[in-house]
């Protein structure tokens, strides 16, 4: 079952009997109108569809649209990753993929995009409902994360389509600064438009491109056909969670905190191309315990239910959840 | 979503001492790594310099042991790199970041903007 997503290809009118001087002056409305259209392009899209063999399988779709190399990949369901969501897949690009129950496959499709594919029976399955996020850090961007989940109404075998939803993923002065800039601009180009009345409106064709990435990890789609995807963003809420949330803890023990303060919406600037980063040589890092950390691909050792990075003053029942629920 | 905030950079003789600390805010984190990362301008990649997860395994890079402390804050959302007998080699950009463990490794999924340090002879 392919899913065909609708993506509007911008095409800047023919330049007709106009001179030099008159497509000259097009450019800059074509740039702008260009920005415009783009500037609210999401950097994560979520997919996810429930298989029509069987009601309790589902496959999570996600993809990032940023030009940065990607160093990791989330997928949780429940909620954002941190924010009382439970992790099912951890994809690091070069050292391997962790996975936890009821994820079943979790794999690359290509460089910028993944798939994982959920299974369970009874309380570990996902309700038809349930949020699921996928939060990809990359460099330089930083990282972001958008969540999607089924329709109520959707049947067996259909999926929704992409759904991109950032969730706190901006610098407020960084979004303020380009909102303003992009809306001078806007106007300007409306200005412009105004003025060019006679001449033909820009024409959006829809393209139909398949979001169906072959199973080996190809190369990422050109900077050109990512900026092109333009969906409505779409924030889904959910009462539905798995009963079973603390089963599908990826650790064993609470998280590194349970809730922090608050602070403005910030995405982090990333130092350096983590996904081109080689895995390090044995020698350079030394252990201080014996104990090994979990292979990749393994479940990571099980830590008791005090033994956290941060512990709360306020007691076990602080920390409660198992990634910290807000 | 996790914001992190470094401080305590700084210029520094060799053989001195310096404190970085990482305060954490926002979104609960769910990853189960944390630590410090460095980069020196003109390097291609960052290099580990310690890093902690979430059952008290810490581990260090063999240019640093037993030079560099890090440790978290009892109760508050905060992790230390204490650096003493700091040398001129290790002037860098210091960053704070949160991730997953993979192999033995701590991969970065939120790191901060960096704090940097520079140790003259």
């Known amino acids: 079952m392919r899913t065909e997503a609708q993506v509007p290809a911008l095409q800047p009118p023919e330049p007709g009997l106009e001179g030099a001087m008159g497509h000259r002056t097009l450019v800059l409305p074509w740039v702008l109108l260009t920005l415009c259209v783009t500037a609210g392009t999401p950097e994560v899209w979520v997919q996810v569809r429930m298989e029509a063999t069987e009601l309790s399988s589902f496959t999570i779709r996600c993809g990032f649209l940023g030009s940065g190399s990607i160093s990791l990949v989330t997928v949780s369901w429940g909620g954002p990753n941190g924010a009382g969501g439970t992790t099912l897949a951890v994809l690091h690009p070069e050292r391997g993929i962790r996975q936890w129950a009821p994820a079943r496959q979790a794999r690359w499709e290509t460089q910028s995009s993944i798939s994982l594919i959920l299974e369970g029976s009874g309380a570990s399955s996902p309700c038809a409902n349930t949020t699921f996020c996928c939060k990809f850090a990359s460099f330089p961007e930083g990282s972001w994360e958008a969540c999607g989940s089924l329709p109520p109404s959707s049947d067996p075998g259909l999926s929704a389509p992409p759904t991109p939803a950032p969730i706190l993923r901006a610098d407020l002065a960084g979004i303020l600064g380009v909102s303003g800039v992009l809306l001078f601009g806007c106007v300007y180009l409306l200005h412009l438009l105004r003025r060019h009345k006679h001449r033909p409106a820009p024409r959006l064709q829809p393209s139909r491109t398949s979001p169906q990435a072959p199973r080996a990890r190809a190369w990422a789609p050109s900077q050109a056909s990512q900026a092109a995807l333009h969906v409505p963003y779409a924030t889904i809420n959910t009462s539905c969670r798995p009963a079973t949330l603390d089963t599908a803890h990826p650790h064993g023990g609470p998280s590194w905190w349970a809730s922090l303060p608050t602070h403005a919406a910030h995405r982090p600037q990333g130092p350096a191309a983590w996904a081109s980063t080689p895995i390090p040589a044995r020698g350079s890092f030394v252990s201080v315990e014996n104990g090994l950390y979990a292979q990749a691909g393994e479940r990571p050792p099980h830590t008791g239910p005090g033994l956290t990075l941060f512990p709360d003053p306020r007691g076990p029942r602080a920390m409660e959840g198992p990634l910290g629920v807000r | 979503h996790v914001q992190l905030v470094e401080s305590g950079g700084g210029s520094v003789q060799a053989g001195g001492s310096l404190r970085l600390s990482c305060e954490a805010s926002?979104?609960?984190?769910?990853?189960?790594?944390m630590g410090w990362f460095r980069r020196a301008p003109g390097k291609e990649r960052d290099e580990g310099v310690a890093?902690?997860?979430?059952?008290?395994?810490?581990k260090y890079a063999d240019s640093v042991k037993g030079r560099f402390t890090i440790s978290h804050g009892n109760g508050k959302y905060i992790l230390y790199l204490q650096m003493n007998s700091l040398k001129p080699e290790d002037t860098d950009m210091y960053y704070c970041a949160a991730g997953w463990t993979f192999g033995g490794n701590c991969s970065p999924a939120d790191w901060g903007q960096g704090t940097q340090v520079t140790v003259s002879s």
């Open positions: 926002g979104y609960s984190y769910s990853g189960d790594c």
């Open positions: 890093t902690i997860d979430n059952a008290g395994r810490i």
